[in-house]
Interface confidence: low
């Protein structure tokens, strides 16, 4: 790992440089303000549950601007190449316990491919505990539960989302590492499709059990703003969305799934350079509060409300929004204090508190619907073999195999 920054200072650069406020080097899209789901600057994805095409309805976002982030989920710190801390944030996968490192041979030999991986711990993403993620060859991790055709649109952790083709070179690998407290994905010596002469990229994303997310960049051979997005989106940052079901106007008995991006952090691509790193530290969210008192007395920047029937604290903007609406939580919480709930039957229509909107029919439906024809808008294919066939448990040179292609 050279050059190794030594004397420039470790934590210095990121210091105090947070997404909470107008910050140099970051553009925050004004997507997270509370309000009606249909507000015009939200990104919406819609999909017929009947297996129809997924349309991405992005309404004109002419309010995109650098804004003060008054709805923060993460504090973000950038460490420049002259920061020793950027070196410290790099996880040396080659030095890790071999049994915890896996070369994903399918991802390492193909282009526009994605594969599900199960974590050994619950990773809190925007306050939601996740056990499964989807690694894509295109330099990002899809964090959604429901696989759809537009993985690159939202619900991602993207150290550098671009049109990478690990299949171009035998030296290119997609490696991941899980030691029970951190999960690291490394895109190692990967080349941009059509831009192979620029050289190889090596970078990683680390998901820590405490919710921290680290992007570390070892080799970035070209200026990121110069990377073409004509064939594949180019993004660096985080995004999350919630999914709601509503009746389809065309087929009344069917339900249409819509995905709404409620928060996004975008890193200025010019800041992505060799030996730099970005660390996202999660801020408290409403979801962490387990009682009405804690919820209503929360001094978070979020407007937390308590839903008695769900026994859940929420701002209404998280992945459980469907339940929040279905159980009338928005209306229930309006103007009510915790004392107002004291006399109510604690068990009335109370579902399992660990229930998520993806736990029931939705997951089952989506799995059977998509598993045979899974392509994203950039033609990233899902590889269902999360374990076993697609993996090597060591760091020996990868062998070229026949790539598994799903869909068309």
């Amino acid at each position: 790992l050279s050059p190794q920054p030594g004397a420039g200072h470790d934590e210095g650069p990121g210091s105090g440089w947070a997404a909470k406020g107008t910050v140099r080097g970051w553009n925050r899209r004004a997507r997270e303000s509370p309000g009606h789901v249909s507000e015009p600057d939200r990104t919406q994805l819609s999909q017929d549950l009947g297996g129809g095409t997924l349309a991405m309805d992005t309404l004109p976002d002419n309010r995109t601007r650098v804004v003060e982030d008054n709805h923060s989920y993460y504090v973000s710190r950038l460490y420049g190449p002259s920061e020793p801390h950027s070196r410290e944030l790099w996880v040396d996968v080659a030095e890790a316990n071999r049994s915890q490192v896996k070369i994903h041979t399918i991802l390492s030999n193909t282009h526009r491919q994605a594969s599900r991986v199960v974590l050994s711990f619950d990773f809190p993403f925007y306050g939601h505990p996740l056990r499964q993620i989807t690694i894509a060859t295109g330099g990002f991790i899809f964090m959604g539960d429901v696989i759809h055709r537009m993985l690159t649109a939202t619900q991602y952790v993207a150290p550098l989302m671009a049109n990478f083709n690990p299949g171009y070179s035998d030296n290119s690998t997609v490696v991941y590492f899980d030691n029970g407290t951190v999960f690291v994905v490394q895109w190692d010596h990967v080349y941009l499709q059509g831009w192979e002469d620029k050289g190889s990229f090596t970078f990683q994303a680390a998901l820590h059990h405490d919710g921290r997310i680290v992007f570390a960049y070892k080799e970035i051979p070209m200026s990121v703003p110069e990377i073409s997005s004509s064939q594949h989106p180019v993004k660096t940052g985080l995004s999350d969305a919630f999914m709601i079901l509503n009746p389809s106007p065309d087929v009344p008995e069917s339900r249409r799934r819509s995905i709404f991006e409620y928060h996004r952090i975008e890193l200025d691509p010019s800041k992505v350079t060799s030996m730099s790193a970005v660390e996202f530290t999660p801020l408290p969210t409403c979801l962490q509060h387990r009682s009405c008192d804690a919820c209503m007395s929360s001094d978070l920047t979020f407007n937390c409300s308590w839903c008695h029937v769900l026994q859940r604290c929420s701002s209404g903007f998280d992945r459980y929004r469907q339940e929040w609406m279905d159980y009338g939580c928005a209306q229930e919480a309006e103007g009510r204090m915790c004392e107002d709930f004291q006399d109510e039957d604690h068990d009335s229509a109370s579902p399992d508190t660990s229930f998520s909107p993806y736990d029931g029919d939705l997951t089952t439906t989506s799995s059977s619907l998509f598993i045979d024809s899974l392509t994203t808008e950039d033609d990233t294919k899902l590889n269902p073999y999360a374990g076993g066939d697609g993996l090597q448990n060591n760091l020996s040179p990868k062998t070229k195999g026949t790539p598994v292609h799903l869909g068309t």
């Epitope: 050059p3 004397a7 470790d10 210095g12 420049g80 190449p81 002259s82 801390h85 060799s274």
Partner: antibody
Framework: EVQLLESGGGLVQPGGSLKLSCAAS????????MSWVRQAPGKGLEWVSG????????YYADSVKGRFTISRDNSKNTLYLQMNSLRAEDTAVYYC??????????WGQGTLVTVSS | QSVLTQPPSVSGAPGQRVTISCTGS?????????VHWYQQLPGTAPKLLIY???NRPSGVPDRFSGSKSGTSASLAITGLQAEDEADYYC???????????FGGGTKLTVL
Amino acid sequence: EVQLLESGGGLVQPGGSLKLSCAASGFTFSDYAMSWVRQAPGKGLEWVSGISRGGARTYYADSVKGRFTISRDNSKNTLYLQMNSLRAEDTAVYYCARYLFGHYMDWGQGTLVTVSS
Amino acid sequence: QSVLTQPPSVSGAPGQRVTISCTGSSSNIGAGYDVHWYQQLPGTAPKLLIYGNTNRPSGVPDRFSGSKSGTSASLAITGLQAEDEADYYCQSYDGRLGVSVFGGGTKLTVL
């Protein structure tokens, strides 16, 4: 307004010691790495030493390693440079600077250290 | 001998454009490390002029601009004014030495 105010400079004999201080205000001191940069009379700038936000990590130029010690007291918003075994070539104006993203965003007015017999 | 090389002096008439070069090597500027520029007016402390190769802190006139290519960088000053007369220093990071490094400084004289 960000202010960095150095003090403690003066005339000292070769082999002697001196302790420089830098009082910081106008920003959250513990959020920033800090550095000392010096400038010999009529010469250019030379990075001397740096310290991480919490003070756990310290860094030195080869020319001062083993003789100078950088430290900080975040409760007092103060940066220090303990200089021992001073030499004539250490004569310079010493600046403390706030460090961010690889550059020195704010500088103090400097304090002159003269090493002479 | 400074790690980064700058011309000792440059000069220009008011209103003219001048450039100051800063040449490094493959272990600093050429390795991709950012270049920063400082202005030091006579008898005062250095002031950050350009950071991250091309960015101006608030309060710095847009007459000042920075660029970087390969192992060198340059500072351009357009519409030269008398108050621009000062010493200018470039700074980067050297991965081999493991330290912040400065250029030797360039004295700008406004004729």
